[in-house]
Every structure is written in structure tokens, then in C-alpha cells.
Interface confidence: low
């Protein structure tokens, strides 16, 4: 560790005095002190002499000697006071910049240690300190404002009592900066823009930060645009806004626009795309299949995506039949806007009734014209079955009619005993009818099929059952011959109530 001579922590001299400070170390040594005039430096191997033959108040300060080669990095210091009755303060810096909650050192050094008892810190023009300003004083270093706040960004002066009057230092501007959490916050509006050639457009790029020192620019594709900047300060944030106004857009204005802001913490950028089109457009689409099948009693949401510019002038859902002239209830139709030019329209059809099958059309209009998108809704029904005994061409025949959607398949069963439904143990014979006759098959309606089972002799202690099934469910009808004719049993439960 180097040694300073004179071997005292403080040295007090009068202006004009000669001062010599000598530092000795094991190796080469260096001096560090306040920037001030009239010092001369002599170095001789492991010693260094700092001297002046005309000390002034500006030489007041702490002089530190270090030995760069010392692995312990030790240093020695001496504080020099040059006590000038006319100049009680030596101000080392007129501007101090700190971040909020740091300690701010205002470096006004007292030139005479005797004056320490009468020092105070004030704001310029004699104004008192702001309330809650917590500060301390060191004659070596000056005033420290502890945990400085943004509001304490002021011009300060150090005051000393000399002969009963207050003598002020030159002012020190304290700038307390907000702690910058990161690059400036950015907004670029709109997020997307579409215009028809010849229309006007505006793109606004704005950046804000707690600190004024940041840059913002707007670029089109990769070209920086020269746009005047408007600046403001509100909500404790600095704001810089660039507004691009285009009176009549053309295709060369289209493309990617990026708003870029940067500060010491880094850079933020956000982009938007500007489309210029020749004329108005209106496109309808759906992620759903336009042909829908739903089981009766269930619900369905029909969704249409609309891409349009300019905005829609009208839209509605229409039921096109074939069952009734009812129209969808407006409360079941709902619109959501995904963004400026894309919307989703939903028609909710809860607990579908047979009369609600058919075509549903979404119509929309803008200056580009009308567009429609039509859904076809077919309802699925479980089969309904009925059996009758009849004679066809002189032969006794069981006739089974099954109605449902999708088209039902038909199976005949013959089983022993009288029963409402054949179970496996009773089954004597099974006939599948792979191609029942289709009696009716209209769009949006049930399909009705007919199956014939020719029976030469009806066995009286047996049951004949017609079963029909499709993807929705199944139905059956049991036919029980009795001596006085035939007895029929529909299923125990009525499978379907619309």
C-alpha cells in the first residue's frame, strides 16, 4: 500500500501557498484528484511528487495515490483544504445524473473545515428543499441526497455561514432519471390497414419511456421515413409520436411498416401491413362443411368468416326452407370482430326441431356488392318402424315400413313364444334385407324404406320382429300372430319425441 507525505489525513492551507504531496510505493504510483490548475507532477521510480506553488480554492479536494502493480489494489488519500474567505465552496461538477433510489452526491467541497457547522443545502434562488428530502454532508465529498426521487430533479446550491451571512456555491443541477425497465413502449396503429387506391390513410407510430433519451422512427419496407416528430410528457412518461398522413394512397405505399424505438436498454419494434387494393372486396368463407348433418334435438352453430373492405353495410341470416317461412331469431345470431377487416358471424341453432332442417344463408353487403354463403342442414333421426300383415299376389306377407335418416337397414327375426322383443335365446331365424325398397327420399326429410317378408304359414306360438337401425339409433316392431288374426306390439318405449 502506498504512503502519502505529509502523513496527515487532512491538510489546510491558504490561497497562494505552496503545497507538495509525495507518494511512495513499492512500484510505480499514480495520483488521482480533483481537476484543478497549477499542479506539477514529478515521478521518480517508486515515488511521485505532486506540487503547486500557488494553491487556490479549486485545489480543495481529496488526492488519492494508487499503486497499479499492487495485487491488493490498495490506495492512500489526503484531503486538501485551501481556505479562501471569499470562496467557501469548490464545486467539482455542475450536473449530477443518477437513477431513482440511488444516492446522489452533489460535489460541493468545503474549502475550510471550520465552516462545517453552518452548512446547508438549498435550491436555487433561496428556495427551501422539497419536503422529505433526506440528505447528509461530508466536508470531503459534499452533500448526499439519499434515495433520490424523480421529483428532486432540481438546481441546488450549497450554503455556508460566513461571518453571519450565507454564502452560496454555484448551482448544481441534479437530474434524477426514472429507472428504465427496458426499451421504450411502442404502439403502431392501426395494426393492419387496407385502403382503396386514391383514399387517404394515416399510420401513427408512438413510443414512450420514463426517460426522454430515446429515438423513434417509422420505416416502410426497409426505408426510414422522414416524418416530423411530436413530443409530449404526460403520466410521468415522455412520448414521441410520428404520424404518417397519406392523402391519396397508391400501390407503392403498400407493404410492411415498422415502428422502431431504442434507448440505452435496447430496441423495440412492431410492424403492421398496409394493403392497397384496386376496389372494394367482400369474401365469405367457413371452416365448417357447408353440408351439415345433426341429430334432431341437438344444437349446431353455423359460423361464417367475413373479410371485407370497406366495412359491412348490412348482413343477415336467412332460412331458405323448405319447411316453413320462419326466420332465425336475431338473438341467436352473433357477430365478433377478429380485427378491423375480419369478422366472424355465428348463428346458434339449439335443440333442432324437424321443421328447422333446410338451407341457411348468410348474406353480407358492402360497397363491393352482395355475397352469400349457404349451409345445407339435414337432421338425423333414429328409425321408426311399423309392421302390417297383408296378402300380395295371394301370398301372406309381412310388410315392414322404417323411416329415419340416414337410410335405415332392415333385419327380420323369427323367435319362439310371444314377446315384445326377440332375445338371442329365442331367435329361430334371422333374415337381412340388404336392399329394402325406398318409398321416399326427399332432401332434408326422413328416408322411408319398405321390406317384405313372405310367410307361407304363420306359426301361432311365434313372434316376427322387424328391426331397423342407422347411425343414430334403432327401432323395432314385433308382430304376434293369434288365432283370430294378428296382434302387433310396438316397442315398449317411444324412442323419439321431436
Amino acid at each position: 500500500i502506498p504512503v502519502i507525505e505529509p502523513s496527515v489525513p487532512e491538510l489546510v492551507v491558504k490561497p497562494g501557498a505552496t503545497v507538495t504531496l509525495r507518494c511512495v510505493g513499492n512500484g510505480s504510483v499514480e495520483w488521482d484528484g480533483p481537476p484543478s490548475p497549477h499542479w506539477t507532477l514529478y515521478s521518480d521510480g517508486s515515488s511521485s511528487i505532486l506540487s503547486t506553488n500557488n494553491a487556490t480554492f479549486q485545489n480543495t479536494g481529496t488526492y488519492r495515490c494508487t499503486e497499479p502493480g499492487d495485487p491488493l489494489g490498495g490506495s492512500a488519500a489526503i484531503h486538501l483544504y485551501v481556505k479562501d474567505p471569499a470562496r467557501p465552496w469548490n464545486v467539482l461538477a455542475q450536473e449530477v445524473v443518477v437513477f431513482e433510489d440511488q444516492d446522489a452526491l452533489l460535489p460541493c467541497l468545503l474549502t475550510d473545515p471550520v465552516l462545517e457547522a453552518g452548512v446547508s443545502l438549498v435550491r436555487v434562488r433561496g428556495r427551501p428543499l422539497m419536503r422529505h428530502t433526506n440528505y447528509s454532508f461530508s466536508p470531503w465529498h459534499g452533500f448526499t441526497i439519499h434515495r433520490a426521487k424523480f421529483i428532486q430533479s432540481q438546481d441546488y446550491q450549497c450554503s455556508a455561514l460566513m461571518g453571519g451571512r450565507k454564502v452560496m456555491s454555484i448551482s448544481i443541477r441534479l437530474k434524477v432519471q426514472k429507472v428504465i425497465p427496458g426499451p421504450p413502449a411502442l404502439t403502431l396503429v392501426p395494426a393492419e390497414l387496407v385502403r382503396i387506391r386514391g383514399e387517404a390513410a394515416q399510420i401513427v407510430c408512438s413510443a414512450s419511456s420514463v426517460d426522454v433519451n430515446f429515438d423513434v422512427f417509422l420505416q416502410h419496407n426497409n426505408t426510414k421515413l422522414a416524418i416530423p416528430q411530436q413530443s409530449d410528457f404526460h403520466n410521468n412518461r415522455y412520448q414521441k409520436v410520428l404520424t404518417l398522413n397519406l392523402d391519396q394512397v397508391d400501390f407503392q405505399h403498400a407493404g410492411n411498416y415498422s415502428c422502431v424505438a431504442s434507448n440505452v436498454q435496447g430496441k423495440h419494434s412492431t410492424s403492421m401491413f398496409f394493403r392497397v387494393v384496386e376496389s372494394a372486396y367482400l369474401n365469405l368463407s367457413s371452416e365448417q362443411n357447408l353440408i351439415q348433418e345433426v341429430t334432431v334435438g341437438e344444437g349446431l352453430n353455423l359460423k361464417v368468416m367475413v373479410e371485407a373492405y370497406p366495412g359491412l353495410q348490412g348482413f343477415n341470416w336467412t332460412y331458405l326452407g323448405p319447411f316453413s317461412d320462419h326466420q332465425p331469431e336475431p338473438k341467436l345470431a352473433n357477430a365478433t370482430t377478429k380485427d378491423t377487416y375480419r369478422h366472424t358471424f355465428t348463428l346458434s341453432l339449439p335443440r333442432l326441431k324437424p321443421s328447422e332442417a333446410g338451407r341457411y344463408s348468410f348474406l353480407a353487403r358492402n360497397p363491393g356488392g352482395w355475397r352469400a354463403l349457404t349451409f345445407e342442414l339435414t337432421l338425423r333421426y333414429p328409425p321408426e318402424v311399423s309392421v302390417i300383415w297383408t296378402f300380395i299376389n295371394g301370398s301372406g306377407t309381412l310388410l315392414c315400413a322404417a323411416s329415419g335418416y340416414p337410410q335405415p337397414n332392415v333385419t327380420w327375426l323369427q323367435c319362439s313364444g310371444h314377446t315384445d322383443r326377440c332375445d338371442e335365446a329365442q331367435v329361430l331365424q334371422v333374415w337381412d334385407d340388404p336392399y329394402p325398397e325406398v318409398l321416399s327420399q326427399e332432401p332434408f326429410h326422413k328416408v322411408t324404406v319398405q321390406s317384405l317378408l313372405t310367410v307361407e304359414t304363420l306359426e301361432h306360438n311365434q313372434t316376427y320382429e322387424c328391426r331397423a337401425h342407422n347411425s343414430v339409433g334403432s327401432g323395432s316392431w314385433a308382430f304376434i300372430p293369434i288365432s283370430a288374426g294378428a296382434h302387433t306390439h310396438p316397442p315398449d318405449e317411444f324412442l323419439f319425441t321431436p
Epitope: 430533479s153 443541477r173 426522454v212 433519451n213 416530423p228 411530436q230 409530449d232 404520424t243 398522413n245 392523402d247
Partner: antibody, heavy 118, light 107 residues
Framework: EVKLEESGGGLVQPGGSMKLSCAAS????????MDWVRQSPEMGLEWVAE??????????FYAESVKGRFTISRDDSKSSVYLQMNSLRPEDTGIYYC?????????WGQGTTLTVSS | DIQMTQSPASLSVSVGETVTITCRAS??????LAWYQQKQGKSPQLLVH???NLADGVPSRFSGSGSGTQYSLKINSLQSEDFGSYYC?????????FGGGTKLEIK
């Protein structure tokens, strides 16, 4: 409350000099851009000069009619802006306003009158 | 330099009427325009900035519009306190020129 107070106006002969001062309060003066604007019945409102903040290197700008004759300056420690006017002409007669620039000329002083006449 | 042409130079109207003052710039000023109101013997006061934005405390009967080179200031349902002179001024670089003014007088 923002306050701007001009002083230094009066009667001066053609070819003479005059220095106008403007004392500001109620805002962070060092961050502000300050301008001088004058008004006369003949010329209406006429922008004269501008000085920007330290962050903008205290850049100065002048109207063509005063370039080389007028000098704008500021003393942030005194929250004051000045207009040194030399080689004055009769057409420089008017009310001189000190203004603060923010989104426009947001704040104006009450004005000080300069008369250039023999 | 950009020239600002304001019209009309004067206007004589009654309380309750609506008036429009226009300002034309010699080149595109991209909405960097301010309007000021000045009453007799007083300093000008900022009314509108950036062509369309009302300054703090300005009544909503005042409105600014325009873009490019054409701008206007509209006053709906004139009140007695609205009489005075109105000036436009551009902020598109320097020099910051003013319009010639419009004097609004009571009929």
C-alpha cells in the same frame, strides 16, 4: 402555473440596439424550447427566433428578416431567455412576445413593446 | 419558405351563428398546424394543435380539420367571448410562418 414575463422594451433610434429578457417559471425551463414572436399592424404575427433545449444542443433558428442582426440566447440557471437586437429598423417596431413551444406556442407572455423611431 | 394564406380577412357575424375560417399552405404541412385566438389587447392563446386537437380548456364548439395544404377552423354557435382575431400557423420546420389573421366582429 406557467409564467413568462418579458422586459426590456422601449423607444430606440434606427440603427440602435436593445436587449429583451424573458423570465420563466412554473416548468422545467432547461427542457423547453423558447421562441420570440412579434406583432405589428403591418406585419401581423411574425415568428422571430427560436432556441432549443440543451438536449438539442441549444440550436438556434431565425426569421430571414432578422438574421445577422438578432441573437437569441438562454440562461438555464436563471430560467431566462434573451433577444439581443442590433441594427434596429423601423419595421422592427411591434409587440414582442416570449413563448414556450410544446405542442404549439402553448404559453405566451404579455409582451413588451419596442418602438424604433427617430 | 412555406406561405400561409388565411381567409377571410374579416367576418361580421351574429351570436349563435356558425363560422368557418380557412387556411391554405403553399405546400403540404402534414397536419402540423396550430390555430390561435387573440382578443383585443391580449396575447394570443393556443386553440388547436396538430390541425385537429383542441388545446386544454378550449370549448368543444371549436373544431379543426384538414390535411395536406387545406385546413379550417369551425366555430359552432358563436358566443360573445369568441369575437376577436384568429391566426393559423404551421410547425413544419422553420421559419414558422403565421397566416394573415381573420378578424371576427359582431354584426
Amino acid at each position: 402555473e406557467v409564467k413568462l414575463e418579458e422586459s426590456g422594451g422601449g423607444l430606440v433610434q434606427p440603427g440602435g440596439s436593445m436587449k429583451l429578457s424573458c423570465a420563466a417559471s412554473g416548468f422545467t425551463f432547461s427542457d423547453a424550447w423558447m421562441d420570440w414572436v412579434r406583432q405589428s399592424p403591418e406585419m401581423g404575427l411574425e415568428w422571430v427566433a427560436e432556441i432549443r433545449s440543451k438536449a438539442n444542443n441549444h440550436a438556434t433558428f431565425y426569421a430571414e428578416s432578422v438574421k445577422g442582426r438578432f441573437t437569441i440566447s438562454r440562461d438555464d440557471s436563471k430560467s431566462s431567455v434573451y433577444l439581443q437586437m442590433n441594427s434596429l429598423r423601423p419595421e422592427d417596431t411591434g409587440i414582442y412576445y416570449c413563448t414556450r413551444v410544446k405542442v404549439g406556442f402553448d404559453n405566451w407572455g404579455q409582451g413588451t413593446t419596442l418602438t424604433v423611431s427617430s | 419558405d412555406i406561405q400561409m394564406t388565411q381567409s377571410p380577412a374579416s367576418l361580421s357575424v351574429s351570436v349563435g351563428e356558425t363560422v368557418t375560417i380557412t387556411c391554405r399552405a403553399s405546400e403540404n404541412i402534414y397536419s402540423n398546424l396550430a390555430w390561435y385566438q387573440q382578443k383585443q389587447g391580449k396575447s394570443p392563446q393556443l386553440l388547436v394543435h396538430a390541425a385537429t386537437n383542441l388545446a386544454d380548456g378550449v370549448p368543444s364548439r371549436f373544431s379543426g380539420s384538414g390535411s395536406g395544404t387545406q385546413y379550417s377552423l369551425k366555430i359552432n354557435s358563436l358566443q360573445s367571448e369568441d369575437f376577436g382575431s384568429y391566426y393559423c400557423q404551421h410547425f413544419w420546420g422553420t421559419p414558422r410562418t403565421f397566416g394573415g389573421g381573420t378578424k371576427l366582429e359582431i354584426k
